[in-house]
Interface confidence: low
């Protein structure tokens, strides 16, 4: 029996304490391998879970989550809220970004505008809860007599802090 | 389409065996199990045993335990279902059934009318 | 083995009315898998039983979604939402969990 259970291929199991040998998997279960002795449950996309791929006999259903919210962890196994451009999400709900930091999604957290004279440059665009700062020449670079050989640093697309 | 097609009817005296024979068409034959349940007049269905069509392997209900063999042809795509030492208590209506998935009965033969007289 | 009782026995029903068959099992035919392993068949007057219901829920192919099942471990039913004249018959319940396999008495349906 164990010989003829290794020939039972995905989409069955093998069930020697009943009738069948291989026996196709019962609706909403599937085997992905060969040989399985039970076939497992198909992954339900429930609630603030949509369907991204059915489940068949051979593969589990892929999940999604539901407009308003975006997925974590590893084959989407959570779905976290939404929530506005200049805010995070923290246990109480969704909070705005502090002053002085910003967050350009729907999801993550809020980080530091850019430090410009870190980089020897200065604030050309203030930055908001939305948006980081955009960096510009410095006050010498800009001042009469200043040499026009190395042209301004490009503005940074807005949104993009340094990790 | 799929079928299960049984042997006719059978008249046989107490003491004998009788053996219905159940032809299966538009499917693989040894990809599923085969049951007999049988029903006698008044009576509820009653479950015999099953057939593994691919290994031959049998399981029978322990209330007919000794009387009855179920076996199958391959190469014909058929089922077999002898029961010896009839009684009285033995007319009844005999089926054969494909189990599709998950002990569920999905295709059942026209059934055979066994009576047993004397 | 697992006894298998229906009630009630008999079911004289209106056209378009509902109807509701219950089945007890006296073991629980709930398999670790997560399905209930139970069955509903008809059996119309000099016919073979047909199949109607499976893994206590799923209908059948071809089985009109009039018919569905509910249930789970020991309790189980059938209902009908609107009752038709084909449904005419005997409904019996069967657990194919553990050899031997058993059936309920059946219950017969009639048109009033």
């Known amino acids: 029996l164990q010989d003829l259970c290794s020939n039972c291929p995905a989409g069955t199991f093998c069930d020697n304490n009943r009738s069948q040998i291989c026996s196709p998997c019962p609706p909403n279960s599937f085997s992905s391998a060969g040989g399985q002795r039970t076939c497992d449950i198909c992954r339900q996309c429930k609630g603030v879970f949509k369907t991204r791929k059915e489940c068949s006999s051979t593969s589990n259903a892929e999940c999604d989550c539901i407009s308003g919210y975006h997925c974590l962890g590893a084959e989407c196994s959570m779905c976290e809220q939404d929530c506005k451009q200049g805010q995070e999400l923290t246990k109480k709900g969704c909070k705005d970004c502090c002053f002085g930091t910003f967050n350009d999604q729907k999801r993550g957290i809020c980080r530091p505008w850019t430090n410009c004279s870190l980089d020897g440059k200065s604030v050309l665009v203030n930055g908001t809860k939305e948006r980081d700062v955009v960096c510009g020449p410095s006050p010498a670079d800009l001042s009469p007599g200043a040499s026009s050989a190395t042209p301004p640093a490009p503005a940074r697309e807005p949104g993009h802090s340094p990790q | 389409q799929v079928q299960l097609v049984q042997s006719g009817a059978e008249v046989k005296k107490p003491g004998a065996s009788v053996k219905v024979s159940c032809k299966a068409s538009?499917?693989?034959?040894?990809?599923?199990?085969m049951h007999w349940v049988r029903q006698a007049p008044g009576q509820r269905l009653e479950w015999m045993g099953w057939?593994?069509?691919?290994?031959?392997?049998?399981k029978y209900s322990q209330d007919f335990q000794g009387r009855v063999s179920i076996t199958r042809d391959t190469s014909a795509s058929t089922a077999y279902m002898e029961l010896s030492s009839l009684k009285s208590e033995d007319m009844a209506i005999y089926y054969c059934?494909?189990?599709?998935?998950?002990?569920?009965?999905?295709?059942w033969g026209q059934g055979t009318v066994v009576t047993v007289s004397s | 083995d697992i006894v298998m009782t229906q009630s009630p026995l008999s079911l004289p029903v209106t056209p378009g009315e509902p109807a509701s068959i219950s089945c007890r099992s006296s073991?629980?035919?709930?398999?670790?898998?997560?399905?209930?392993?139970l069955g509903w068949y008809l059996q119309k007057p000099g016919q073979s039983p047909q199949l109607l219901i499976y893994?206590?829920?799923h209908r059948a192919s071809g089985v009109p979604d009039r018919f569905s099942g509910s249930g789970s471990g020991t309790d189980f039913t059938l209902k009908i939402s609107r009752v038709e004249a084909e449904d005419v018959g005997v409904y019996y319940c069967?657990?194919?969990?553990?050899?031997?396999?058993?059936f309920g008495q059946g219950t017969k349906l009639e048109i009033k």
């Open positions: 059934a494909r189990e599709g998935v998950a002990g569920a009965f999905d295709i």
């Open positions: 538009g499917y693989t034959f040894t990809n599923y199990p």
């Open positions: 057939s593994n069509a691919g290994s031959g392997n049998t």
């Open positions: 073991q629980r035919l709930l398999h670790s898998n997560g399905f209930n392993y």
């Open positions: 893994l206590g829920s």
């Open positions: 069967m657990q194919p969990l553990q050899i031997p396999y058993t």
